[in-house]
């Protein structure tokens, strides 16, 4: 039921799930200098029954200075460069009750979490696309992709989206936000998932329940 590959890569665009289907896994990764606690969970899992979905297991990180034989899970710099990333504000919404039946919302950050989030999606997951700042969608309406099972094999539908840089120099209100890098993930990467996110609290944004993220590519 896990999707075999990642959602389609669209140049100058990023994607986000509104909610995560039961069965979705989120790797417990720690930032550099920290590691999972001994006997800590490898991942969080979206589970539930007909009326309630929540993330099982809690990710916990501790300082690597503490002598321990637990394997370091912080991504190495070369691995970080290869993964598709987005910047993310710290979610402010309650998270254990699902937004949609059979779905979990974005888990809150855990202490000393890695700058990337790696999700393993399941069949039926939908992700939504948005052109990064400075780029325009040529098509009208939303752009989305769904992981489907066809003839025993999973595939993501292709979103109707082309993001173009055709615009005058834009001036953005308030604080300047980082411009997107046009670089995409290398073709060779075929891991089972996966969105990753860079946590960053930005001012001026008060979100009630939505996953509050600003989307650019990792630089």
């Amino acid at each position: 039921e896990l999707c075999d590959d990642d959602p389609p890569e669209i140049p100058h665009a990023t994607f986000k799930a509104m909610a995560y289907k039961e069965g979705t896994m989120l790797n417990c990764e720690c930032k550099r200098g920290f590691r999972r606690i001994k006997s800590g969970s490898l991942y969080m899992l979206c589970t539930g029954n007909s009326s309630h979905s929540s993330w099982d297991n809690q990710c916990q990180c501790t300082s690597s200075a503490t002598r321990n034989t637990t394997k370091q899970v912080t991504p190495q710099p070369e691995e970080q460069k290869e993964r598709k990333t987005t910047e993310m504000q710290s979610p402010m919404q309650p998270v254990d009750q699902a937004s949609l039946p059979g779905h979990c919302r974005e888990p809150p950050p855990w202490e000393n979490e890695a700058t990337e989030r790696i999700y393993h999606f399941v069949v039926g997951q939908m992700v939504y696309y948005q052109c990064v700042q400075g780029y325009r969608a040529l098509h009208r309406g939303p752009a989305e992709s769904v992981c489907k099972m066809t003839h025993g094999k999973t595939r993501w539908t292709q979103p109707q989206l082309i993001c173009t840089g055709e615009m005058e120099t834009s001036q953005f209100p308030g604080e300047e936000k980082p411009q997107a890098s046009p670089e995409g993930r290398p073709e060779s990467e075929t891991s089972c998932l996966v969105t990753t996110t860079d946590f960053q609290i930005q001012t001026e944004m008060a979100a009630t329940m939505e996953t509050s993220i600003f989307t650019t590519e990792y630089q």
Epitope: A137, M205, A207
Partner: antibody
Framework: QVQLVQSGAEVKKPGSSVKVSCKAS????????ISWVRQAPGQGLEWMGG????????NYAQKLQGRVTMTTDTSTSTAYMELRSLRSDDTAVYYC???????????????WGQGTMVTVSS | DIQMTQSPSTLSASVGDRVTITCRAS??????LAWYQQKPGKAPKLLIY???SLESGVPSRFSGSGSGTEFTLTISSLQPDDFATYYC?????????FGGGTKVEIK
Amino acid sequence: QVQLVQSGAEVKKPGSSVKVSCKASGGTFSSLAISWVRQAPGQGLEWMGGIIPIFGDANYAQKLQGRVTMTTDTSTSTAYMELRSLRSDDTAVYYCARGGSVSGTLVDFDIWGQGTMVTVSS
Amino acid sequence: DIQMTQSPSTLSASVGDRVTITCRASQSISSWLAWYQQKPGKAPKLLIYKASSLESGVPSRFSGSGSGTEFTLTISSLQPDDFATYYCQQYNIYPITFGGGTKVEIK
């Protein structure tokens, strides 16, 4: 076909706050921005700002920075606009409007709510 | 901020007339311009986006043209339902701004 249904008219005192809601009926939010536009009686249209529901990124008009907050609740497909420290010149019809494409909040508006009249009077 | 100047502010016309409304931007906005129609007590309705693209469901008598700083909305043959106020909107640069409106009234 998605429709945007807004909350009812409000009468407020100067200095108070108002929170207007905008619910997507007949569909759910996606990554299309929800913007807020107001129109004072007999006047033209003024863009207040916009937010992308799933992504959460918001942009506000400079003149309203610090007084306005836009949020969304994806579980109910509802957007909210809160305006604080109300003044008499905030009296207007407030519209929510959906962006026509996934180009952030810098977009045209293809679907509009019916409008919410907010009167600020002592 | 980009100023959007519409002319004329009021236009008197008869059914069947060809009507042209002009919108000027204080600086180039490429083709990122939309036109809306608004009737009293109602929300605006999108007619044209990206300067010349007709929104789905809008009658073909409406057309838009222009790029850079000069834009026009043309109604090829004015119908009774077209008497309303028309606004242009630029969405190239924040903040998004609207023209002051052109009221099309019955002559």
